[in-house]
């Protein structure tokens, strides 16, 4: 009789352990679902806010035609400026035409006045050729005036209405550029 009772007790204990395991699994599953839900909601929120706020450029960016521009409020060296633009899903400004150059310099005059702003132009150390960040060459009218006698890497910047060159390790403001969102209307 005693043996029978102890067997039943062991079985009950085993059952309890299994139930505890099941409860633990369920709690874990519930927590995982809650996390998934949180990410899903965040995604929906992002998508909805993008849909509602269908402005072609983010806040504090300036639009001109198909481009959005961000004029920095901090100084950094050229390489860090590029990183800062990438964080925003953009690259340093690439000036394609005189019209774009005029828009940029006109906007800078209104915003800040005559400061130095890094753009996505750098001089290849071996060939001495100026290239934009994507590897393309600037049009002949958009080559920096030679001002830098630096032995270090040389990068391009905008000041007033000119393109100039300087040691990439000097600190300047910078301008980022990204494509404007196309309106779906």
């Amino acid at each position: 009789k005693l043996l029978q009772v102890s067997t039943i007790a062991m079985q009950q204990q085993e059952k309890l352990i299994q139930q505890e395991r099941a409860l633990l699994n369920f709690t874990e599953w519930k927590r995982s679902c809650a996390l998934q839900m949180k990410y899903c909601q965040a995604f929906m929120q992002n998508s909805l806010s993008s849909a509602h706020n269908s402005s072609p450029c983010p806040n504090n960016w300036i639009q001109n035609r198909e481009s959005c521009y961000y004029v920095s409020e901090i100084w950094s060296i050229w390489h860090t400026s590029q990183e800062n633009c990438l964080k925003e899903g953009s690259t340093l400004l690439q000036i394609e035409s005189k019209e774009e150059m005029d828009f940029i310099t006109g906007s800078l005059r209104k915003i800040k006045g005559s400061y130095d702003y890094w753009v996505g132009l750098s001089q290849d150390g071996h060939s001495g050729r100026w290239l934009w960040q994507d590897g393309s060459s600037p049009s002949p009218g958009l080559l920096p005036a030679e001002r830098s006698q630096s032995a270090n890497q040389v990068c391009g910047y905008v000041k007033s209405n000119s393109l100039l060159s300087s040691n990439c390790s000097t600190w300047k403001y910078f301008i980022c550029e990204k494509y404007a969102l196309r309106s779906s209307v």
């Epitope: 990410y39 899903c40 995604f43 992002n46 990438l86 964080k87 925003e88 899903g89 953009s90 690259t91 960040q133 994507d134 590897g135 550029e177 990204k178 494509y179």
Partner: nanobody
């Protein structure tokens, strides 16, 4: 947590053309840009190439015209096609993701050794 898995590195002959891949997986996140960086022994880590979610590209001067970065947005994967490799391209190549929430994620790196 976000995982970045690089592949495609190894021993390559000078002039060779390997392609590196970096696949991002884990919790859902929006990507602002993805990039490849490299670090040669005794040198600082430097940006090699990057691509934004809009498709804009940026390259280091030393690789312009030889390397091409591309992406597959659907797979959250970025590729680096490396052509005309030189011994100075020997380094550990790291993948980096700039997420829209401001977070940045690094891969563990893949070794590329250019030697005959």
């Amino acid at each position: 947590q976000v995982q970045l898995q690089e592949s495609g590195g190894g021993l390559v002959q000078p002039g060779g053309s390997p392609r590196l891949s970096c696949a991002a997986s884990g919790r859902f996140f929006r990507v602002n840009a993805m990039g490849w960086y490299r670090q040669a022994p005794g040198k600082q880590r430097e940006l090699v190439a990057a691509i934004t979610n809009g498709g804009q590209t940026a390259y280091a001067d030393s690789v312009k015209g030889r390397f091409t970065i591309s992406r597959d947005s659907a797979k959250n994967t970025v590729y680096l096609q490396m052509n005309s490799l030189k011994s100075e391209d020997t380094a550990v190549y790291y993948c980096k993701v700039f997420a829209a929430d401001g977070m940045e994620y690094w891969g563990k790196g893949t070794q590329v050794t250019v030697s005959s």
